[in-house]
């Protein structure tokens, strides 16, 4: 099964995907596609990187993080209900069957007119971490788990990276204090 990520119509959606480059600047090709990861490729590609740069992207899809450090998380701008569905992040590590592939489910909810949800409720969903395990085919694809051990430095960093998300706005506007421990 895949982990579910949520956004509201009109917001930016964030789908996390990371890898650790063997050395700084030693990048591997990555592709993002709409639809579950097929056996070799990425489905209907919306964004692709090569060993140097983003070499293909479509409107509204971009990488907000530092992809040169392995943060290839996808941001989808101004989402609509039609953006709901499964997305594939495929890290095309050279070698024999080294690909890492992740299926992420994006659920788009109609825009709320009620107050924003509390920080407590959205915390885990907004700060996921990759559990990177390898699979050799779609049936063995592993996906993502929730974050068990965030610290304040990570919160600060992630909040900056997710500045368009509701949680980042909550952190900024509410002055919330988060206790770890």
């Amino acid at each position: 099964s895949e982990v579910e990520y949520r956004a509201e119509v009109g917001q930016n959606a964030y789908l996390p995907c990371f890898y650790t480059p063997a050395a700084p600047g030693n990048l591997v090709p990555v592709c993002w596609g709409k639809g579950a990861c097929p056996v070799f490729e990425c489905g209907n590609v919306v964004l692709r990187t090569d060993e140097r740069d983003v070499n293909y992207w479509t409107s509204r899809y971009w990488l907000n993080g530092d992809f040169r450090k392995g943060d290839v998380s996808l941001t989808i701008e101004n989402v609509t209900l039609a953006d709901s569905g499964i997305y594939c992040c495929r890290i095309q590590i050279p070698g024999i069957m080294n690909d890492e592939k992740f299926n992420l489910k994006l659920v788009i909810k109609p825009a709320k007119v009620t107050p924003a949800p509390t920080l407590q409720r959205d915390f885990t969903a907004a700060f996921p971490r990759m559990l990177t395990t390898r699979g050799h085919g779609p049936a063995e694809t592993q996906t993502l788990g929730s974050l068990p051990d965030i610290n304040l430095t990570q919160i600060s960093t992630l909040a900056n990276e997710l500045r368009d998300s509701r949680l980042a706005n909550d952190l900024r506007d509410s002055g919330a204090t988060i206790r770890i421990g």
Epitope: A36, V39, I86, D99, G137
Partner: antibody, heavy 119, light 111 residues
Framework: EVQLVESGGGLVQPGGSLRLSCAAS????????MSWVRQAPGKGLEWVAA???????YFPDSVKGRFTISRDNAKNSCYLQMNSLRAEDTAVYYC?????????????WGQGTLVTVSS | DIVMTQSPATLSVSPGERATLSCRAS??????????MQWYQQKPGQAPRLLIY???NVESGVPARFSGSGSGTDFTLTISSLQSEDFAVYYC?????????FGGGTKVEIK
């Protein structure tokens, strides 16, 4: 028009090596996974190697460690290097294009090149 | 590995008749609601030709008399009214897992 043209087949002794080439034209080669599929005389089809658009490699156990696949996007070409050849590797070898966005099935095939492993 | 078993090995049919070919996978090839199963046609001395992908989608340029159905482990290729050019060998193939595997083929011959 999409075209795939294989070359490099021939007669080789057991234990020998051979390098097959597949020249592609009529499509944006770098966007597609490419595979090699073989067919022994009078037998069925067997997939033997694939390389994704990003350069990841895939093989069945029957050829792993003996065969390798590579691609040169600048030359629109795909290659199958076959080492430690055995009599059971005798077959027509087809180069096949994986369907865009998937790669796991084949919408265009070359006409094949015959590899005969015999002493 | 996923083993693909086709039946019958040979099918004798008269022109104009309906042909039904079967393929069974050793495990499910369903993936997020799609059956990762293909059918190919091969004539003597020629390369295979893709007919059906994802169990039931007819490849562009393939006559409408060809259709595919099935899900899970059991799949069928149907040729509604056999034409002379349809006598060939037909292979199923799964794209669920590496290694990609083909069935042993069904030869459709003239009765």
């Amino acid at each position: 028009e999409v075209q795939l043209v294989e070359s490099g087949g021939g007669l080789v002794q057991p234990g020998g090596s051979l390098r097959l080439s597949c020249a592609a034209s009529g499509f944006t080669f770098s966007r597609y996974a490419m595979s090699w599929v073989r067919q022994a005389p009078g037998k069925g089809l067997e997939w033997v190697a694939a390389i994704s658009s990003g350069g990841s490699l895939y093989f069945p156990d029957s050829v792993k460690g003996r065969f390798t696949i590579s691609r040169d996007n600048a030359k629109n070409s795909c290659y199958l290097q076959m080492n430690s050849l055995r009599a059971e590797d005798t077959a027509v070898y087809y180069c096949a294009r994986g369907r865009e966005a998937d790669g796991g099935y084949f919408d265009y095939w070359g006409q094949g090149t015959l590899v005969t492993v015999s002493s | 590995d996923i083993v693909m078993t086709q039946s019958p090995a040979t099918l004798s049919v008269s022109p104009g008749e309906r042909a039904t070919l079967s393929c069974r996978a050793s495990e499910s090839v369903e993936y997020y609601g799609t059956s990762l199963m293909q059918w190919y046609q091969q004539k003597p001395g020629q390369a295979p030709r893709l007919l059906i992908y994802a169990a039931s989608n007819v490849e562009s340029g393939v006559p409408a008399r060809f259709s595919g159905s099935g899900s899970g482990t059991d799949f069928t290729l149907t040729i509604s009214s056999l034409q002379s050019e349809d006598f060939a060998v037909y292979y199923c193939q799964q794209s669920m897992k590496v290694p990609l595997t083909f069935g042993g083929g069904t030869k459709v011959e003239i009765k």
